[in-house]
């Protein structure tokens, strides 16, 4: 179904790896496609076959050398081709000229961790993974701590424009048990996007000492 | 914003050749991946051939590889369908399509955002 809208997505987490999702309405689930990737510069090339994520979209992730080795930099451009296969023969779905570096996503940040709390405040750390020496310090999180009885849709984004890997969380309520995620984003690249969301963290607020509060 | 104007269309015989130029206004072009699509009298548009932003990559109808060629000048904010050994099941309207920046070309015409008014071309037997 060549006439079906189709979208192939790729994003590159700053370090070794190379995300992609290719969509195309009223594709089989079975067909077999694969992302090849061909950089201008360097000597390599990379391939990763696409699997089903849903009904007409696929992904997978071109691993181009160890997690925190730099296999790219803002100068390389990266010629992604999807292949899908259509019998004996192998047919070209779509092409792109892909600069790493303005499409960046990175990876989750990890290694959430609560350093202290009290009755109305917690103060939470985590760290960045698998994100390029090149950013240095340029760098924006953001947060969010999801409070009893709501979801994580209604709780307000809290916004740190700078590489702050630590947060103070304040006004909570004694005794309480919430959950607390943060994402990361560089602010370079014209089309990067926000990290996924880290696993949650857990945590209760001590209780509030009798006779007070 | 991405403006395309397509020329070079024309009647020629079967066995020759035509090369159509689109002429695309923007400052982004230089890094669009461009297209060209085809309509036929009482047929849907279908995706012909289309190129990278460097010119890298290109990627063809299995209808016309081999005989068309797909290319781009960007200093001139131009892209051109050489057309040779035409045939007159060729004959169509030809149209160039501009991906959003940052966007894959495709097969699909949903993949383009912006559109020339198209060029005729007539191959007579």
């Known amino acids: 179904a060549v006439n079906g809208t189709s979208r192939f997505t790729c994003f590159y987490n700053s370090r070794a790896n190379i995300s992609c999702v290719w969509s195309q309405d009223g594709a089989l689930q079975d067909t077999s496609c694969q992302v090849h990737a061909w950089p201008d510069r360097r000597r390599w090339n990379q391939t990763c076959e696409l699997l089903p994520v849903s009904q007409a979209s696929w992904a997978c992730n071109l691993i181009l050398g160890t997690p925190d080795s730099q296999k790219l930099t803002a100068v390389d451009i990266v010629t992604l081709r999807v292949m899908c296969r259509e019998g004996v023969r192998w047919r070209m779905m779509a092409i792109q000229d892909f600069k790493p570096f303005e499409n960046l996503r990175l990876m989750a940040p990890i290694s959430l961790q609560v350093v202290h709390v009290e009755t109305h405040r917690c103060n939470i750390s985590w760290k960045i993974s698998q994100a390029s020496h090149y950013f240095e310090r340029h760098l924006e999180f953001e947060a969010r701590t999801l409070s009893p009885g709501h979801t994580w849709e209604e709780a307000p984004l809290m916004t740190l424009k700078q590489k702050q890997e630590w947060i103070c969380l304040e006004t909570l309520t004694p005794d309480t048990q919430y959950e607390f995620q943060v994402r990361v984003k560089p602010l370079q690249g014209e089309f990067t996007t926000w990290s996924p969301w880290s696993q949650p963290l857990a945590f209760r607020t001590k209780p509030a000492a009798l006779g007070k509060d | 914003e991405v403006q395309l104007v397509e020329s070079g269309g024309g009647l020629v015989q079967a066995g020759g050749s035509l090369r159509l130029s689109c002429a695309a206004s923007?400052?982004?072009?230089?890094?669009?991946?461009m297209g060209w699509f085809r309509q036929a009298p009482g047929k849907e548009r279908e995706f012909v051939a289309a190129i990278t932003w460097t010119g890298r990559g290109t990627m063809y109808a299995e209808s016309v590889e081999g005989r068309f060629t797909i290319s781009r000048e960007n200093a001139k904010n131009m892209v051109y369908l050489q057309m040779n050994s035409l045939k007159p099941e060729d004959t169509a309207i030809y149209y160039c399509?501009?991906?959003?920046?940052?966007?894959?070309?495709?097969?699909?015409?949903?993949?383009?955002?912006?559109w020339g008014q198209g060029t005729q071309v007539t191959v007579s037997s």
């Open positions: 399509a501009a991906a959003r920046r940052g966007r894959a070309a495709v097969r699909s015409e949903g993949g383009y955002d912006f």
């Open positions: 923007g400052r982004t072009f230089s890094t669009t991946e």
